[in-house]
Every structure is written in structure tokens, then in C-alpha cells.
């Protein structure tokens, strides 16, 4: 079986990770989605999740993580602002579909955060417009306590660091044997 693909991002402290996770519109538009970190040999841990049912274009913020679910376009936008070196690691988006296993969205994100150049600000906002303003009306959603009965059968690739997680963190299984198929138009 093929392993999950990863996309690697190399960013500096203070910068913003801004990625999307595409999903099948009809099936998952209102389903609750989550952003997880995968630590070596452990089950994925949820760092933030949308509301249930997921609201359209409604920002949900947990610490420095902002999730926005765009139903009409079938995408979840994930932002991690003011990145720190400790944020380095392996991440993924999943869709909750209890009582079934969470559905993992492509691709996994390998985030590498390094210290900024000495003598320069750590943030990239000095060179680009301050675009990632956190919306004033954000919601902190409570993630469901959903632990899969399956055990982790294969340790995921080693992440470079731990990430501090909110109080609502939960464990989910590692999902394997999915391959990404690029779509061209």
C-alpha cells in the first residue's frame, strides 16, 4: 500500500502558514473538520476544529490557529499565525464522521519553522502587507471527544518538534494507505 504524501513548508518565525484542505462538497460541506498534529508513534492530536455542524465562512480560532470552512468551494482554510520554532511538525486535516473513522484530507503538511535572520524581524509582515488579520468575531469550538477503537499500526514520519495544544485536544487514529491524486483543469 502506498503511504500518504506530504507537502513541506519552510517558514521563518513570525510568518503565517496558510493552507487549504479540499473536500468533496456534497458529502462533507457541513461536517465538522479538525486540524491535527501527528507526533512520532502517537495517535494524531486535534489542535482545533470547526463547529458542529460546520458553519460557512465562519472563522474559528484556537490560540494561533484559525479555521475557516468555505462550503461553496469545498475547502477548509487553515492558518497558523506568528509561527514559532516549536510549531515544527507534521499536520493533517480530517473530517469527523462519527461513528465512522475520521476522513483524512490530502495532503499532510510537514512544517519546518526556523529562526529569523539575525538583526531582522522574525515576521514576514515587514515585506508583505499585514494580510492575516485575525477576524474580530471568531468562535472557539469544542472538539468532540472521539477516540477510535483502532490502534496505530505504523508510526508516522517523525516530527521535528512538539506543539503545545489547547485544553480540548483529543486523540484520533492514524489513517494510512491513502494516495493523493492531483486534479488538473
Amino acid at each position: 500500500a502506498t503511504k500518504l504524501t506530504e507537502e513541506k513548508y519552510e517558514l521563518k518565525e513570525g510568518q503565517t502558514l496558510d493552507v487549504k484542505c479540499d473536500y468533496t462538497l456534497e458529502k462533507f460541506a457541513s461536517s465538522q473538520k479538525a486540524w491535527q498534529i501527528i507526533r512520532d508513534g502517537e495517535m494524531p492530536k486535534t489542535l482545533a476544529c470547526t463547529e458542529r455542524p460546520s458553519k460557512n465562512s465562519h472563522p474559528v480560532q484556537v490560540g494561533r490557529i484559525i479555521l475557516e470552512d468555505y462550503h461553496d468551494h469545498g475547502l477548509l482554510r487553515v492558518r497558523m499565525v506568528n509561527l514559532q520554532v516549536e510549531d515544527s511538525g507534521l499536520y493533517q486535516c480530517v473530517i469527523y464522521q462519527p461513528p465512522k473513522e475520521p476522513h483524512m484530507l490530502f495532503d499532510r503538511i510537514r512544517l519546518v519553522v526556523t529562526k529569523g535572520f539575525s538583526g531582522t524581524p522574525g515576521s514576514n509582515e515587514n515585506s508583505t502587507q499585514n494580510v492575516y488579520k485575525i477576524p474580530p468575531t471568531t468562535t472557539k469550538a469544542l472538539c468532540p471527544l472521539y477516540t477510535s477503537p483502532r490502534t496505530v499500526t505504523q508510526a508516522p514520519p517523525k516530527s521535528t518538534a512538539d506543539v503545545s495544544t489547547p485544553d480540548s485536544e483529543i486523540n484520533l487514529t492514524n489513517v494510512t494507505d491513502i494516495i493523493r491524486v492531483p486534479v488538473f483543469n
Epitope: 519552510e10 510568518q15 514576514n124 492531483p182
Partner: antibody
Framework: QVQLVQSGAEVKRPGSSVKVSCKAS????????ISWVRQAPGQGLEWMGG????????NYAQKFQGRVTITADESTNTAYMELSSLRSEDTAVYYC??????????????????WGQGTTVTVSS | DIQMTQSPTSLSASVGDRVTITCRAS??????LAWYQHKPGKAPKSLIY???SLQSGVPSRFSGSGSGTDFTLTISSLQPEDFATYYC?????????FGQGTKLEIK
């Protein structure tokens, strides 16, 4: 097949502003990254900034900060680049280009894969 | 900002030659690199994305490789229509930046 069609050539006076449009047809517009790139005579390509229309937020290269404004109108599938306080060095061909990434976490996974035909802006007194 | 440095800045070659252009990023950009071909009076054309993937419709004589900071564009057997200026571009993080270009001329 996605196409980007830009507005026509412009001749402007120093100190004035120019607004170039870029209309997309034949594909979803909202989740593209629409970048603006220019090439001055005898110079290389220069990325000015970009926008994801769905989010409405723009990123700009530091060189153009404060002088360039990139916007998008989802209802007409059109992106705009306005450059103010024009000087002779702004004489260039201005291109819009699409970045996209379906099935991927990266908005510009495929790079800038579709380009407009270019708009010549001449700044002269 | 991430600086992209291309070499050589100009290159003379003949039809049938194998040509290699290199691009170096001032910091790691994973595989988020694209290569473009630009001819006078025309819009740039995308050749390679994600460092090594061939854009749809681009001839297989073009190939890309590299990851991190060092990247290469190779044209295995130059054709008359390949004489143009080539640019690399990083899109790992904003602001996206281009290399200064490599002008490929007929010897």
C-alpha cells in the same frame, strides 16, 4: 480552458495612477491566486503581489508597498492592480497570472500556470 | 524576502545541445519552485512546477530537479524554439520571488 484577458495599453503622466484589469473565464476564479508580475524594458520578471479573491486579502512585495493595491471582484471574475504615484521606472509590461492547487494544500501548487497577454503601461511626461 | 539566484545569466548553445540552468534560493523552499520560459512580446510560459513536475503540454525534453535550496532546469536536446529567457520562481512563502533570468542564445 482557463483564460486571463487583460485591459489595453495605457499611457500615463508621472505622479498619476493606473488601474489594470484581468478577467478570468473558463474556470473557477475564487480560489485562484491571482498574481501580478511586471517586466520593465531590459529587466527580468518582478512579482508585485497577489490575491485570493475568495479571501479578499492581498500580499505585496515590499518594493511596491503603499503604491500598489490589488483587488478582485468575484461577481465579474475580474482582478485589478492599481499602481499610484507613477514614475518613469514604472514603464513596463504588466501581467496577471493564475496560481492554483486543487487536490493540494498549496494554493499555488502548480505555480503560475496561466498568464494574461500583458498590458503595456508607459509613464511619460 | 527569499532571494533567487540563477546561473548563468546568459548562455550560448546550439540546436541538439544539452543545457542546464541552476537556481539557488537564499533559504529552504522545499519543492515550491517553478520554471518559466519567456520570449519577447509574449507572456511567460510555465514549464515546471513543484521543482520537478512537467506542466501539461510541455515537451519532455524539459526537466527539473532539486529540493531545499538548489534546483536545476535541464533541456536534454535544444530545439530552435527553445531559445528564450528562463526564470525560476519560489512560491514557498510570500512575497513570491523570481530569479534574475538566464538568456539562452543561439551559438
Amino acid at each position: 480552458q482557463v483564460q486571463l484577458v487583460q485591459s489595453g495599453a495605457e499611457v500615463k503622466r508621472p505622479g498619476s495612477s493606473v488601474k489594470v484589469s484581468c478577467k478570468a473565464s473558463g474556470g473557477t476564479f475564487s480560489i485562484y491566486v491571482i498574481s501580478w508580475v511586471r517586466q520593465a524594458p531590459g529587466q527580468g520578471l518582478e512579482w508585485m503581489g497577489g490575491i485570493i479573491p475568495l479571501f479578499g486579502t492581498a500580499n505585496y512585495a515590499q518594493k511596491f508597498q503603499g503604491r500598489v493595491t490589488i483587488t478582485a471582484d468575484e461577481s465579474t471574475n475580474t482582478a485589478y492592480m492599481e499602481l499610484s504615484s507613477l514614475r518613469s521606472e514604472d514603464t513596463a509590461v504588466y501581467y496577471c497570472a493564475r496560481g492554483h492547487g486543487p487536490g493540494s494544500s498549496h494554493y499555488s501548487y502548480y505555480g503560475l500556470d496561466v498568464w494574461g497577454q500583458g498590458t503595456t503601461v508607459t509613464v511619460s511626461s | 524576502d527569499i532571494q533567487m539566484t540563477q546561473s548563468p545569466t546568459s548562455l550560448s548553445a546550439s540546436v541538439g545541445d544539452r543545457v542546464t540552468i541552476t537556481c539557488r534560493a537564499s533559504q529552504g523552499i522545499s519543492s515550491w519552485l517553478a520554471w518559466y520560459q519567456h520570449k519577447p512580446g509574449k507572456a511567460p510560459k510555465s514549464l515546471i512546477y513543484a521543482a520537478s513536475s512537467l506542466q501539461s503540454g510541455v515537451p519532455s525534453r524539459f526537466s527539473g530537479s532539486g529540493s531545499g535550496t538548489d534546483f536545476t532546469l535541464t533541456i536534454s536536446s535544444l530545439q530552435p524554439e527553445d531559445f528564450a529567457t528562463y526564470y525560476c520562481q519560489q512560491y514557498n512563502s510570500y512575497p513570491y520571488t523570481f530569479g534574475q533570468g538566464t538568456k539562452l542564445e543561439i551559438k
